[in-house]
């Protein structure tokens, strides 16, 4: 599974969208986790509503918000007030029982706000938008291929 690289400005919001086959993952909750080390476990940050039919409602844990459009097959994670410590490798997951299926791997990079830099020059930052979609440096060519379904008993 390829890794999608997303860049966001410190202090702003970064929105991550993970797409999936809506029918294949019907009835499954989604989660956003942070991978601890390259081969380490993925530590849950936030997951969608416990009742799947209410997955469209936003669930928050600290500065991270998740919501799932189960019909469109898109789970959206928003990292608010991005900080340098938020940089790292994350996963969008589909949950069923004990199984956590990786939908997408995302490498979050945090850029320093150029306005804080005296040498920023004439770089223009939109005033109205505090949300940053993220510069997709590398697209995943297999974002719907799962490689880590299930940890078997």
């Amino acid at each position: 599974l390829n890794t999608t690289v997303l860049q966001g400005m410190a202090g702003q919001s970064l929105r991550v969208s993970c797409t999936y086959d809506a029918l294949k993952h019907w009835g499954r909750r989604k989660a956003w986790c942070r991978q601890l080390g390259e081969e380490g476990p993925c530590q849950r940050v936030v997951s969608t509503h416990g009742v799947w039919l209410l997955a469209f409602l936003k669930k928050r844990n600290g500065s991270t918000v998740i919501a799932d459009d189960t019909l469109a097959g898109t789970v959206t994670i928003t990292l608010k007030n991005l900080q340098a410590g938020d940089a790292g490798l994350y996963q969008c997951q589909s949950l069923r029982g004990r199984e956590a299926e990786v939908l997408q791997k995302v490498l979050v990079e945090v850029l320093e706000d150029p306005l804080d830099d005296q040498d920023a020059g004439d770089l223009w930052v939109p005033e109205e938008s505090s949300s940053f979609e993220g510069a997709q440096v590398e697209h995943s060519t297999s974002r719907n291929q799962e490689t880590s379904f299930p940890p078997t008993s």
Epitope: W26, G97, E99, P150
Partner: antibody
């Protein structure tokens, strides 16, 4: 009518290859997982594995991993179970079944539609 | 793998009896538990999914209960057509293992 129709009984010799089929109709074949279950003579049910025909994503029971191959051809709504080299111990009834869709707060679906079964006999 | 243990392995009962079959998982499986009925020479039939949800078309005399590791299938009033073998199955983690089965015979 939603149904799964399996291929007919097979009699084979040890070492031979075999591919049995399971054809779905009456529903969107690509949108449901299909599982395979073995039942040896006079014994209980054994879960072999599942496949999602939409993208051929497959999960195997460790007991059957490497022993059989599960595949699907979504263009003809058919799932397959195959052996490259049969053994006498593969003699059994094999069922294909559809995993139902979520309809509650827990996504335990159950296998809600079953094929009629395919008898495989392996004997020298 | 998660082991599913059914008890009893067989039982004899009469028409009209209340019959209870239990299934125990080797670890907690929440409510990811299904029950099937199989008659000789036939494919299994789904009775109960998600531990307690009655599958469409299944008579209301069948009911399921339990959560975690201990589950029960109850037939409130045994009918002639209910003499069969019953299997539980967990869907909590691959492989989705079955119990060994409980054969319900006529007394």
């Amino acid at each position: 009518e939603v149904q799964l129709v399996q291929s007919g009984a097979e009699v084979k010799k040890p070492g031979e290859s075999l591919k049995i089929s399971c054809k779905g109709s009456g529903y969107s074949f690509t949108s449901y997982w299909i599982g395979w279950v073995r039942q040896m003579p006079g014994k209980g049910l054994e879960w072999m594995g599942i496949i999602y025909p939409g993208d051929s994503d497959t999960r195997y029971s460790p007991s059957f991993q490497g022993q059989v191959t599960i595949s699907a051809d979504k263009s003809i709504s058919t799932a397959y179970l195959q052996w490259s080299s049969l053994k006498a111990s593969d003699t059994a009834m094999y069922y294909c079944a559809r995993l139902g869709h979520y309809s509650g707060t827990v996504s335990s679906y159950g296998m809600d539609v079953w094929g009629q079964g395919t008898t495989v006999t392996v004997s020298s | 793998d998660i082991q599913m243990t059914q008890s009893p392995s067989s039982l004899s009962a009469s028409v009209g009896d209340r019959v209870t079959i239990t299934c125990r998982a080797s670890q907690s499986i929440s409510s990811y538990l299904n029950w099937y009925q199989q008659k000789p020479g036939k494919a299994p039939k789904l009775l109960i999914y998600a531990a307690s949800s009655l599958q469409s078309g299944v008579p209301s005399r069948f009911s399921g209960s339990g959560s975690g590791t201990d589950f029960t299938l109850t037939i409130s009033s045994l009918q002639p057509e209910d003499f069969a073998t019953y299997y539980c199955q967990q869907e909590y983690a691959v492989p989705y293992t079955f119990g060994g089965g409980t054969k319900v015979e006529i007394k």
